[in-house]
Amino acid sequence: YHGCPSECTCSRASQVECTGARIVAVPTPLPWNAMSLQILNTHITELNESPFLNISALIALRIEKNELSRITPGAFRNLGSLRYLSLANNKLQVLPIGLFQGLDSLESLLLSSNQLLQIQPAHFSQCSNLKELQLHGNHLEYIPDGAFDHLVGLTKLNLGKNSLTHISPRVFQHLGNLQVLRLYENRLTDIPMGTFDGLVNLQELALQQNQIGLLSPGLFHNNHNLQRLYLSNNHISQLPPSVFMQLPQLNRLTLFGNSLKELSPGIFGPMPNLRELWLYDNHISSLPDNVFSNLRQLQVLILSRNQISFISPGAFNGLTELRELSLHTNALQDLDGNVFRMLANLQNISLQNNRLRQLPGNIFANVNGLMAIQLQNNQLENLPLGIFDHLGKLCELRLYDNPWRCDSDILPLRNWLLLNQPRLGTDTVPVCFSPANVRGQSLIIINVNVAVPSVHVPEVPSYPETPWYPDTPSYPDTTSVSSTTELTSPVEDYTDLTTIQVTDDRSVWGMTQAQSG
């Protein structure tokens, strides 16, 4: 293959791969017809002048995961056909000016996961055809004005995982073609008004895991094409009334892990395409009427791990397409019987880890498609007669860790649980808390003949019984409903992220695992 170095493998498709710790310099001679060269996991520490001079047909060059700390300015001379250059995962602290001169065809430049301390306008001034620039995972503390002014064709810019404390409002002004801008995991405390005004084609903006406290009211007003906006894990305590007003294309918005105390009606919208709204881990204490009414296509609404103690009966108005509603780990004591009435397509509702003492008999009256209800770890002593009778698709019901009062009034619930076993997931069984003679016994195996007669007046209304289990053979014998939407927190889905940190999500959804970035 036109002379393949012994340390490398060369394929018929003009691909050369050189790997191994024994490599300390760019191997020679490289095949003159090589179109793709990968130098990975070696002990190369520097690139000298023109090591690739004789492979001018090269289109892709990956020099990754090495010990590379120094590059001579002319290292990439004669690579006029190069379209893809990756120097990711090395030990570069500085880039020589002019390093990328002559790379007129370069479209993708990956400099991520190095130790770069600064970039200058002169670094990229020759890269007029660049479409993708990856600078995440470095030590950049600021971006000078003009750094990207010549990159007018850039569509993807990743500055995540640096040490940026502020952004100049002019730094992105010439990037009219930019579609993806990632600034996650920096130290930004605020974003000046106008910073994103020139980004009229922006589709994704990742600002999560910074220290942003305030959002300027018009910060996103020029970003009409924005589809994904990640604002999670910041210090945002309030949302200006008009901040999301000009985002008609938005389909993903994450606000979890902030300090939001309240949500005003109309704050979200109009966003006809928004499918998911993640608001867990905030300080929200109540939900007013019509707060989500502009989100007609919303399918996933996560409000868990807040301090919600009151939900207005019309809080969920307009959410006719909602499939998943997470309200777990809040401070709810009571729910209005009509609060879920508009959620005709709801499939999963999680209400665990609240202080619910009772549920209205009609709480699920219009939510006929419910498949999973999480009610564990509340203060429930009983449930109204017939509360689940019409839920023919229900196949997961969690009731454990409640102080069930096992007097004769518990029999309808006990019977329902027993007769509906084939439709319910195998889970921790509800246990009696009172009276004392049955405390600790499983609710479904208490001796009904010694169940204490009830002496209380029911606190909750019940509605007429309906057939609890239609006589059809179509119910499955075993069940395991898992809503993938609810099970996974939003992963900011970056193609250039190689590792995703997965955390045990029992506290976020109470079901399985999620990535909460």
Partner: antibody, heavy 113, light 111 residues
Framework: QVQLVQSGAEVKKPGASVKVSCKAS????????IHWVRQAPGQGLEWISY??????KYNERFRGRVTMTRDTSTSTVYMELSSLRSEDTAVYYC????????WGQGTLVTVSS | DIVLTQSPDSLAVSLGERATINCRAS??????????MNWYQQKPGQPPKLLIY???NQGSGVPDRFSGSGSGTDFTLTISSLQAEDVAVYYC?????????FGGGTKVEIK
């Protein structure tokens, strides 16, 4: 005390129907399931169906031939079996609760031409 | 359907001795961590009587000499000290899923 009292013995011809009643007393009628089980002479027990809150569930072997109803005003449950055959000759029992904790005395249904 | 197989078909035990009846299910009858296996006693000319429910819980008024054990597919009814009035046919029954099914019965007699 809890009691389930069933109607008396029946003799039926093949193809006919029989309706057996089970009157409950001594407990809150609507709080418990009522099952029907039968036992052919010298044989074991076979579950037929149950009723609870007007919802019913049937053994597929009897589907289309058995109908369960109840009258809450008299605390009575009825089991009607149609298209009788000789192999339906058995003692028919009603039993209370999911765990069959109380049983009626049984009703002998004889199917013979 | 879940098939229950009882063994032995019949059992002769001396008064005061232990009697053990086994019941094997064709699939697990466990749910919620509870085994939905029940045991009934039937004397000639009488309806069955609930002895044990949910594998190990005694029915009302059932003498302490009757006990149940097991989980999953294998279950046992034990009469610790057989009395004359215990002569009967004993049935196991699963109530995990419809159709609820009974074992074929075990006849217990005095040796």
């Amino acid at each position: 005390q809890v009691q389930l009292v069933q109607s008396g013995a029946e003799v039926k011809k093949p193809g006919a129907s029989v309706k057996v009643s089970c009157k409950a007393s001594g407990y809150t009628f609507t709080s418990f399931v009522i099952h029907w089980v039968r036992q052919a002479p010298g044989q074991g027990l076979e579950w037929i169906s149950y009723i609870y809150n007007d919802g019913t569930k049937y053994n597929e072997r009897f589907r289309g031939r058995v109908t369960m109803t109840r009258d809450t005003s008299t605390s009575t449950v009825y089991m009607e079996l149609s298209s009788l055959r000789s192999e339906d000759t058995a003692v028919y029992y009603c039993a209370r609760d999911y765990y069959f904790d109380y049983w009626g005395q049984g009703t002998l249904v004889t199917v013979s031409s | 359907d879940i098939v229950l197989t009882q063994s032995p078909d019949s059992l002769a035990v001396s008064l005061g001795e232990r009697a053990t009846i086994n019941c094997r299910a064709s699939e697990s009858v466990d749910y919620y961590g509870i085994s939905f296996m029940n045991w009934y006693q039937q004397k000639p000319g009488q309806p069955p009587k609930l002895l044990i429910y949910a594998a190990s819980n005694q029915g009302s008024g059932v003498p302490d000499r009757f006990s149940g054990s097991g989980s999953g597919t294998d279950f046992t009814l034990t009469i610790s000290s057989l009395q004359a009035e215990d002569v009967a046919v004993y049935y196991c029954q699963q109530s995990k899923e419809v159709p609820y099914t009974f074992g074929g019965g075990t006849k217990v007699e005095i040796k």
